[in-house]
């Protein structure tokens, strides 16, 4: 089955907090949630960037005709192509708690199809042939998913809906906790 591009446009999907893996709540700290007592700067979105397109999962809308041999759909169908980067753009103190962002390298996320939809199309054929009905599977939405370290790039782990959202307004925990005290938590953060 062939595809003929007709027109396209793009929708920018800025990933929500829940679309990224979260460490346990005890890894969050007051500095991440409230910069006011640490210099008065307002809180930033963990994935804030001056150039939004640099780090976002984009849904490119393509309108195409479905073809099957000499036959072509009576109407074009619209489907999505997933494009763009997934990950934090700027490393800011309030982004801690979202992951170990202070590291220079970390979990690899990809923007890939999340949901699909089936659409029935009618194909018109030349030479007086009877129209054919075909069901096509189209991408309905895109999502950031993590490349797991145990699988190939094509097999992606979905951290979409099950990730807990950060708890706002948590009480500060003492700074004095050592790296060792947190080691068990850190090892399980991903």
């Amino acid at each position: 089955q062939g595809w003929q591009a007709f027109k396209n446009d793009a929708t920018e999907i800025i990933p929500e907090l829940g679309e990224y893996p979260e460490p346990p709540p005890e890894l969050e700290n007051n500095k991440t949630m409230n910069r006011a007592e640490n210099g008065g700067r307002p809180p930033h979105h963990p994935f804030e960037t001056k150039d939004v397109s640099e780090y976002s999962c984009r849904e490119l809308h393509f309108t195409r005709y479905v073809t099957d041999g000499p036959c072509r759909s009576a109407k074009p169908v619209t489907e999505l192509v997933c494009s763009g980067q997934c990950g934090p753009a700027r490393l800011l103190p309030n982004a801690i708690g979202r992951g170990k962002w202070w590291r220079p390298s970390g979990p690899d996320f990809r923007c890939i199809p999340d949901r699909y939809r089936a659409q029935r199309v009618q194909l018109l054929c030349p030479g007086g042939e009877a129209p054919r009905a075909r069901k096509v599977r189209l991408v309905a939405s895109c999502k950031c998913k993590r490349l797991t370290r145990f699988h190939n790039q094509s097999e992606l782990k979905d951290f979409g809906t099950e990730a807990a959202r950060p708890q706002k307004g948590r009480k500060p925990r003492p700074r004095a906790r050592s790296a060792k005290a947190n080691q068990a938590e850190l090892e399980n953060a991903y």
Partner: antibody, heavy 119, light 111 residues
Framework: EVQLVESGGGLVQPGRSLRLSCAAS????????LHWVRQAPGKGLEWVSG????????DYADSVKGRFTISRDNAKNSLYLQMNSLRVEDTALYYC????????????WGQGTTVTVSS | QSVLTQPPSASGTPGQRVTISCSGS????????VNWYQQLPGTAPKLLIY???QRPSGVPDRFSGSKSGTSASLAISGLQSEDEADYYC????????????FGGGTKLTVL
């Protein structure tokens, strides 16, 4: 201009201690995570340690764990590396480096300070 | 022995396209983002590529990065004499307590 300047290197005997410092300027210091990376003469790069904004946001390479301690003083825009029980194999040029982008590589580097461990 | 494996040397003539490979495992490149650094003779390293294929501002688009499975590569097109340098790949390694690991470096010679 974004700048990191290392100091504190020198010649030291095995088993002794040394403290490296890194002074930052030209950027908002506490928006950066900071790291130490070393390079032995004629060899490649080796990451030593990294620190975020809190005492529990710290990582060490296995080769220095238990001997080196990384710390930062945001009020002084400074990063430190306390090196104890130094070994001959710790001889290297020590770079201070920072990352301003989550998981985005070390995008600012100092010029390095030389540590020589020899008897 | 470096955790990430790079060819010790590579070469090309001006204008050519050169590719440097970096091979790792499931605990580093397989699940984490890859960064590339350029170190010109006698200078500090410079970030060339981050997050597998992103260029920091100021890095020419002649430099590009890619990743597939447990390997990554750096491609330099339109090779110039000033590209003669050592190139290092790096990624977080999740083994044990984890650390940031570099490849052994590739010395690129522009003939």
């Amino acid at each position: 201009e974004v700048q990191l300047v290392e100091s504190g290197g020198g010649l030291v005997q095995p088993g002794r201690s040394l403290r490296l410092s890194c002074a930052a300027s030209g950027f908002t210091f506490d928006d950066y995570a900071l790291h130490w990376v070393r390079q032995a003469p004629g060899k490649g790069l080796e990451w030593v340690s990294g620190i975020g904004w809190e005492d529990d946001m710290i990582d060490y390479a296995d080769s220095v764990k238990g001997r080196f301690t990384i710390s930062r003083d945001n009020a002084k825009n400074s990063l430190y590396l306390q090196m104890n029980s130094l070994r001959v194999e710790d001889t290297a040029l020590y770079y201070c480096a920072g990352n301003s982008r989550g998981y985005g590589g070390l995008d600012v580097w100092g010029q390095g300070t030389t540590v020589t461990v020899s008897s | 022995q470096s955790v990430l494996t790079q060819p010790p040397s590579a070469s090309g003539t001006p204008g050519q396209r050169v590719t440097i490979s970096c091979s790792g495992s499931s605990s580093n490149i397989g699940g984490n983002t890859v960064n590339w650094y350029q170190q010109l003779p006698g200078t500090a390293p410079k970030l060339l590529i981050y997050s597998n294929n992103q260029r920091p501002s100021g890095v020419p688009d002649r430099f590009s990065g890619s990743k597939s499975g447990t390997s990554a590569s750096l491609a330099i097109s339109g090779l110039q004499s000033e590209d003669e340098a050592d190139y290092y790949c790096a990624a977080w390694d999740d083994s044990l307590e984890g650390s940031y690991v570099f490849g052994g470096g590739t010395k690129l010679t522009v003939l």
